[in-house]
Structures are given as C-alpha cells and as structure tokens.
C-alpha cells in the first residue's frame, strides 16, 4: 500500500504517457488521477511500467471501482490483467467476446492460469451457454478447454456449437464427457451424408451406444483402430464379429496387435472362437465351440 502524499508541484500527470515510468511509486499514487487512468487504459500497455508501478495503477483503479471494473476498462487492461486476482475478476461482468479475446491474448501460449479460468467461467455464466463463437475462441486459445469442463457444464453446450469443435479439442476428454457430447454431435451433423458424417462424428464416437455402432457398420466407414480403441467397452461388447469386420473394413487386421487391450480383449472373450477364426487373424480367447452362452443381463431384464 502506498501512503498518501501530496503531488509535487509540476508533476501532476496531464495524460498517461512514458514520462510516468520515471515516477516513483508514491508519485504515481499522488499525481495520476484515477479517472484519467481509466479513460486512457489503452495507453498503459505500450508503456514499460515495472510490476511495482502496475501495482500502484491497479490500486488506483480498485479505489475508483470498488464494486468491479466496467467493461470499458477491462477491455484495455492488457498486461495489467496479470495483476488481477480471481477475486478481482469475480466482480466483473464481461459480456463482449472482444474483451475476452483481448485478455486471453495476454496469456497466449501458456497454460490456463487461475485468472483466465475465472474469467472464462464468468463470461460463460454471463452468456448462459457455450455458444459457437465463444467455443471457437476458447478452443483456439486452449485446445484442451472443452475437456476441462464437467459433464454438467458440457450439458449447456448447444448442438450448434459442436461445429466449432476440432478433433484435437477432444484429445483429453474422458468417456463421461464424450457421453454428453456425442448426442449433441449426432444432432448437429444429422443432415450430412454418410462419409462426410463419419468424418465429423468420428472424434465423438467414444460416447456412441451399440446401436449407433451397428448402424455405422452398415455404411462402409472403415473406422481406424485408434478410433475403435476409444469406443466404450459396453458399446463394443454386443457387436458381432461380422459387424466389427464391416465397421473396421481393411483396418480389421489391426485387431491382432490390440488383442490384449480393452475394448478388443473384452470383446474377444464374448465371441465364439469359430467366428473369430473366420477373420483369419489368429485371435485367441473366444468361447470354445459347443459352449452355450447365456446372456444373463437379458434374463434379468425379462424377469
């Protein structure tokens, strides 16, 4: 905290300019008018103030706006944003995407700081949902953003926003998140033709149910093994050998390399060895011939 002292004669700042970098902290406090600072915030970014000097400028803004800064000031904070705490940011009401972009730019190229996480949270809550433009912006700055959200938060993403999602944005999503995103993607891409649809839906298939995988197997999609390995185990288990063969097309040969890993391992255990042998891949571990397979889950459902 800088103590209050009178501004020396001739030192009152008529504007925010480079001469202020030569002011001591107490001179900045005494000689810079807070209202002037607020109206000329856009200049601060270009002036090489030290962090101690930025502390003084922040203190002046805090005194002027104890309830939180107006958006006209927030948009021009620039590097002063690095001085803000999450508590400061919780007082803000940020509604403009341009303001959000301006502040994300300050943090560009680095992982999400607590300040940025709070800012995004405030912005999204203010908008009520993650619209396409917001999602576009956030994933451009932070490809992992979508997967940092909880399934509950993801439920507020409208299907129309799914068009903004790139495959790399889903790299770190877990099955619970994909369970929420997949139905939205299915809805968003429903009017596309077969091959185009598959290209778009592929990244989301970790949330697909069995019936959708069965439907895809009828469309000559040639799913690659990397995608197959990310499918839900419970969705893969009921697929027949013929369905998996159609689903993977020429990539079916890759099953051999993955036979010890889920979901391939668990799927093999559920297939008749006879059926597996028809693939000619030497997959082992299926149900021996002559054994009866009881589907207990079906029996429980009937009783």
């Amino acid at each position: 905290e800088v103590e209050k002292t009178a501004c020396p004669s001739g030192k009152k700042a008529p504007e925010i300019d480079e001469s202020l970098i030569f002011y001591k902290k107490w001179e900045l406090e005494a000689c810079v008018d807070a209202a002037l600072l607020a109206t000329q915030m856009d200049r601060v970014n270009a002036i090489p103030f030290t962090y101690e000097q930025l502390d003084v400028l922040k203190h002046k803004l805090d005194e002027l706006y104890p309830q939180g800064y107006p958006e006209s000031v927030i948009q021009h904070l620039g590097y002063l944003f690095l001085k803000m705490s999450p508590e400061d940011i919780r007082k803000w009401n940020v509604t403009s995407l341009e303001t959000l972009k301006a502040l994300l730019e300050v943090n560009k190229g680095h992982e999400m700081s607590p300040q940025v996480a709070t800012l995004i949270d405030r912005f999204v809550k203010g908008r009520g949902q993650l619209d396409k433009d917001t999602l576009d912006t956030l994933t451009a700055f932070y490809p992992g953003y979508l997967c940092s959200l909880s399934p509950e938060e993801l439920s507020s993403v409208p299907p129309s926003s799914i068009w903004a999602v790139r495959p790399q944005d889903l790299d770190t999503c877990d099955p619970r998140q994909l369970d929420v995103l997949y139905p939205k993607a299915r809805l968003a891409f429903q009017n596309m033709n077969g091959s185009e649809y598959f290209v778009k839906i592929q990244s989301f298939l970790g949330g697909a149910p069995t019936e959708d995988l069965k439907a895809l197997s009828q469309q000559n999609v040639s799913m690659d093994l990397a995608t197959f390995m990310k499918l839900r185990t419970d969705a893969v288990l009921p697929l027949t050998v013929a369905e998996v063969q159609k689903l993977l097309g020429p990539h079916v040969e890759g099953l051999k390399a993955e036979e010890r890993h889920r979901p391939v391992r668990d799927w093999i255990l559920r297939q008749r060895q006879d059926d597996l042998d028809t693939l000619g891949l030497g997959l082992q571990g299926g149900i021996p011939n002559g054994y009866l397979v009881l589907d207990l889950s079906m029996q429980e459902a009937l009783s």
Partner: nanobody, 119 residues
C-alpha cells in the same frame, strides 16, 4: 526463470565513457522491455533508461544527451553507452527486464555493476 548478468562497470574519470552490457538467459521469450536503474550512495533506486522490445527508448532528464540505450534482440542483450560521465553518475547500475506473460510474469533484476566517476 530469467537470469540477467551485467558487465562493463569500473572506475572512470569525469568526462570519460563506459559501456555497460546486460545479457539475459533462461526464459527470454516475452521480454517486453529492458532498462537500466541506478542506486547512488544514500539514494533510492532510480530509472536511468529503458527500451521496449520494439526499440523505443526513454531517458531520465539527468542523462538525456549523454547516455544511449540499445538492445540486441537476437542476443537478448541490452547496452548502456555512457558518455560525458559526471561524479554524480557514480552508483551501482542494475539491469532490469519486464516479462509480461505467464508462467513467470514480473520484473527481473541483475546483481548490479559498480560505476565510479572520480579523478
């Protein structure tokens, strides 16, 4: 993190010249400005000259026309050419760098180099 190492200080007669250098190493990306501060006996540290990453320089009134600051962005080095030195320029000169992005935003300082102007 960011390290700054100054060199070039020494004893010089009034009217003489010295050239200080400050080399930055470590997290040198995102340095937006580098400058020279000094602290004379019994005085507080004061800014002498600063230069931004875009090459814009500013000088304290007491050194205008005598000192020149320059920056070699490729070498991440800042220089202070000091001419027409006066006894009142005697001080420890500190190099400073502003780093304006995460994960380590802040002001970074060198250890200082002594400049003594005396006959």
């Amino acid at each position: 993190q960011l390290q700054l190492v100054e060199s070039g200080g020494g004893l010089v007669q009034p009217g003489g010249s010295l050239r200080l250098s400050c080399a930055a190493s470590g997290s040198v990306n995102s340095i937006t400005a580098m400058g020279w501060y000094r602290q004379g006996p019994g005085n507080e540290r004061e800014l002498v000259a600063v230069i931004t990453d875009r090459g814009r320089a500013s000088y304290a009134d007491s050194v205008k026309g005598r000192f020149a600051i320059s920056m070699d962005n490729d070498k991440h080095t800042v220089y202070l050419q000091m001419d027409s030195l006066k006894p009142e320029d005697t001080a420890v000169y500190y190099c400073n760098a502003h780093r304006r992005t995460w994960p380590h935003p802040g002001d970074y300082w060198g250890q200082g180099t002594q400049v003594t102007v005396s006959s």
